[in-house]
């Protein structure tokens, strides 16, 4: 070994200076007699080395690095040898920080593993190997006097927690506990905890279960859940309080907390929930009134609340078959009476014969919004209910009565936009209780079964905007019937379009006669089409070879036209435009040539 480095300290505070000396022995005679010692930190040459020859012939270079800003680096002492740098010796330098005081030390007692688990936050990175030790002692009092020491607990590398096993614990007796952090630059200690392991006990949560329905127990009310829990048996002797949390499975709702519940409640009816909704529930417990830690939340239990009977008003409307007046088609619409009006599973129409107490005969049971049934001859009234698994809505009576009320007058309809129609009327006297408005395709597509209907509850209304099932270019029949206390008025009807269509094509032009300066044209008008506006007029256009255009407007009843003032022996392009209020369409172009001056007229 020709050279040897010694340093003031191999480990320093990051940013602190460091001094190193390198001595080259005299017996390295193969070297230059006055060798220049160079210093390198990592890969970089470091200036500032002070070199001297000592009395024994050795060469010494001393360097002070003012700030060691690398957490780890190699310092090398070198010589130039030929064209390369020869390393004579090197040392590893390390820089970092003394350990910060470990903080947030906390412990919990696990009664299943019979160990006290303590964890802490080690603080910022020291950049140096730092060991942590959980230290503790038993104490009779409040940890002012130290009793027996407990074996140090050393966590596995990189871990910030450690378990003190049962054999080192004394329950119901205080322990002093702290963390010591140590590295080459110093030692630090966390504030000491003084605790009885039982005061930091963390229990296992109960297991939530659904309650087995018993025959004598009443079923849960709508929006309620009946549940029970199986406590963690080993913890049952510990007084605890528990809390339950729940949230609907769907949607973004946050957890709602219910508590405190005594652990011993063992069963519970949770109410005030949404009916017919799936909920996720969890429970946790804590030693109480003595100190402790909350248990983890239990595994989830998923339960569905019972639904509530439908709370709806059923608006009804009916129609008799013309060929068989005892066959009735009944229509209805559910109108929610509350925000959550309950799920509707189906509808039942029933009739109670007079003189048969309690006997109810179902006429139909359906999930649709209408049904057709044969009305018994003595029946003047039926009852309609909506139902689900929780029960039925209040029955809606439907009375089948003659049309004895006054009719409304001046029924009219007009388009609002392509998808709505306004129907208006003059109310009769006395005012009706309301109206039924029906609408559907008019002839030729008319069908009773495909009609849409609405109930207008306001008897003083003078119109209604139809927004459902209205399409442009279709003819609609709109029927309005006034409703009275025990009867109805005669139905009135009107036809209307929400938007009419331009003519689909204009008639074809035909040449009937032609001369030198005139041409007689004719056409067959298109038959009127439903959904299309009637024609308002025709316009005929003709263009000569010089691209001059001429036109004439003709009334809608025209069937022909004579073009005058044409040039002989000239080419003309002619087309017809058919127009209505909804737009216009052009015919195909007819091309013709007038006769030469010496030619005879063609008829």
């Amino acid at each position: 070994e020709c050279g040897h480095i010694s340093v003031s300290a191999p480990i320093v505070h990051l940013g602190d200076p460091i001094t190193a000396s390198c001595i080259i022995k005299q017996n390295c005679s193969h070297l230059d007699p006055e060798p220049q010692i160079l210093w390198r930190l990592g890969a970089e040459l470091q200036p500032g080395g002070r070199q001297q020859r000592l009395s024994d012939g050795t060469q010494e270079s001393i360097i002070t690095l003012p700030h060691l800003n690398h957490t780890q680096a190699f310092l090398s002492c070198c010589l130039n040898w030929g064209n390369s740098l020869q390393i004579l010796d090197q040392v590893e330098l390390r820089a970092g920080y003394p350990p910060a005081i470990p903080h947030n030390l906390s412990c919990l007692m696990n009664l299943t593993t019979s160990s006290l688990i303590c964890q802490w936050e080690p603080g910022p990175e020291t950049h140096l190997p730092t060991s942590f030790t959980l230290k503790s002692f038993k104490s009779r009092g409040n940890c002012q006097t130290q009793g027996d020491s407990i074996l140090d607990c050393v966590p596995k590398d990189g871990q910030s927690h450690c378990c003190i096993p049962r054999k080192h614990l004394l329950l119901y007796q205080n322990m002093g506990i702290w963390v010591q952090a140590e590295n080459a630059l110093g030692t630090s200690m966390s504030p000491q905890l003084c605790l009885d392991p039982m005061d930091v006990v963390k229990l296992e949560p109960p297991m939530l279960r659904t309650m087995d329905p018993s025959p004598e127990a009443a079923p849960p009310q709508a929006g309620c859940l009946q549940l029970c829990w199986e406590p963690w048996q080993p913890g049952l002797h510990i007084n605890q309080k528990c809390e339950l949390r729940h949230k609907p499975q769907r949607g973004e709702a946050s957890w709602a907390l219910v508590g405190p519940l005594p652990l011993e409640a063992l069963q519970y009816e949770l109410c005030g929930l949404l009916p017919a909704t799936a909920y996720t529930l969890q429970i946790r417990c804590i030693r109480w009134p003595l100190p402790g830690h909350w248990s983890d939340w239990s595994p989830s239990l998923e339960l569905r609340t019972t639904e509530r009977a439908p709370t709806v008003r059923l608006d009804t409307w009916w129609r008799q078959r013309q060929l068989d007046p005892r066959t009735v088609q009944l229509f209805w619409k559910p109108v929610p009476l509350e925000e959550d009006s309950g799920r509707i599973q189906g509808y039942v129409v029933s009739w109670r014969p007079s003189g048969q107490a309690g006997a109810i005969l179902p006429l139909c049971n359906t999930t649709e919004l209408s049904c057709t049934f044969h009305l018994p001859s003595e029946a003047q009234e039926v009852a309609l209910v909506a139902y689900n698994s929780a029960g039925t809505s209040r029955p809606t009576p439907v009375v089948f009565s003659e049309s004895r009320g006054p009719a409304l007058t001046r029924l009219h309809a007009m388009a609002r936009d392509p998808h709505s129609l306004w129907v208006g009327w003059e109310p009769p006297n006395p005012w009706p209780q309301g109206y039924v408005i029906e609408w559907g395709l008019g002839p030729p597509s008319a069908s009773n079964s495909n009609k849409t209907w609405r109930m207008e509850q306001n008897g003083r209304a003078t119109g209604f905007l139809l927004k459902e099932n209205i399409r442009p270019f279709q003819l609609y029949e709109i029927i309005v019937t006034p409703l009275y206390q025990d009867t109805m008025g005669p139905s009135q009807h009107v036809y209307a379009y929400s938007q009419e269509m331009a003519p689909s094509h204009a008639p074809e032009l035909h040449l009937k006669h032609i001369g030198k300066t005139w041409a007689q044209l004719e056409w067959v008008p298109e038959p009127p089409e439903l959904g299309k506006s009637p024609l308002t007029h025709y316009t005929i256009f003709w263009t000569n070879a010089q691209n001059q255009s001429f036109s004439a407007i003709l009334n809608a009843s025209s069937r022909g036209f004579v073009l005058h003032g044409l040039e002989p022996a000239s080419l003309y392009h002619i087309h017809l435009m058919a127009a209505s209020q909804a737009g216009a369409t052009n015919s195909t172009v007819l091309t013709l040539m007038t006769l030469t001056p010496e030619g005879s007229e063609l008829h």
Partner: antibody, heavy 118, light 107 residues
Framework: EVQLLESGGGLVQPGGSLRLSCAAS????????MGWVRQAPGKGLEWVSS????????PYADSVKGRFTISRDNSKNTLYLQMNSLRAEDTAVYYC???????????WGQGTLVTVSS | DIQMTQSPSSLSASVGDRVTITCRAS??????LNWYQQKPGKAPKLLIY???NLQNGVPSRFSGSGSGTDFTLTISSLQPEDFATYYC?????????FGGGTKVEIK
Amino acid sequence: EVQLLESGGGLVQPGGSLRLSCAASGFTFSLYWMGWVRQAPGKGLEWVSSISSSGGVTPYADSVKGRFTISRDNSKNTLYLQMNSLRAEDTAVYYCAKLGELGQSMLWGQGTLVTVSS
Amino acid sequence: DIQMTQSPSSLSASVGDRVTITCRASQGISSYLNWYQQKPGKAPKLLIYYASNLQNGVPSRFSGSGSGTDFTLTISSLQPEDFATYYCQQSWQIKLKFGGGTKVEIK
């Protein structure tokens, strides 16, 4: 002074009933589970029943289930054991015990003798 | 239900002897095991709870160890007042079963 005092033991015919009481003093009775343990003459200890601090949980040994009922009155600091349909094999010294949080019987009464014999 | 088996059912020993009594549970009970001492005509007395915790006022010659299913009560140096019957009891389940007992007699 912390103590438990049993009473109500005595001689009873098979099929008869007896009610044991245990008066507690010196500690907050309502915070602790309590229990009954019995010992037949010349035999070992047999746990009979326990009751939670508020009385909501009451486990029983299979040998007495359906015949014995444990109860407590926290306002009177008293524990009870109602014994019905008594059998000869129920003859024993009945001890009242205060239970700790880990199920240990921390404190025992002096015992009361129940003899079931015709 | 958990069954508790104690062994031996009886033993003879002299003052100063080290005495070991074992208790086995039919299933794992963590550390939920308690030891009691009973002298003739007296109520039992709690010695050790939660497998190894010495009850207040109990001499330190008594110690407990074990977890899971196998447990031991050790009297490091038997004293004249220690001749009695010793019982183990599990409290993992709320049906608190006792072992059959071990009678420690003077040799």
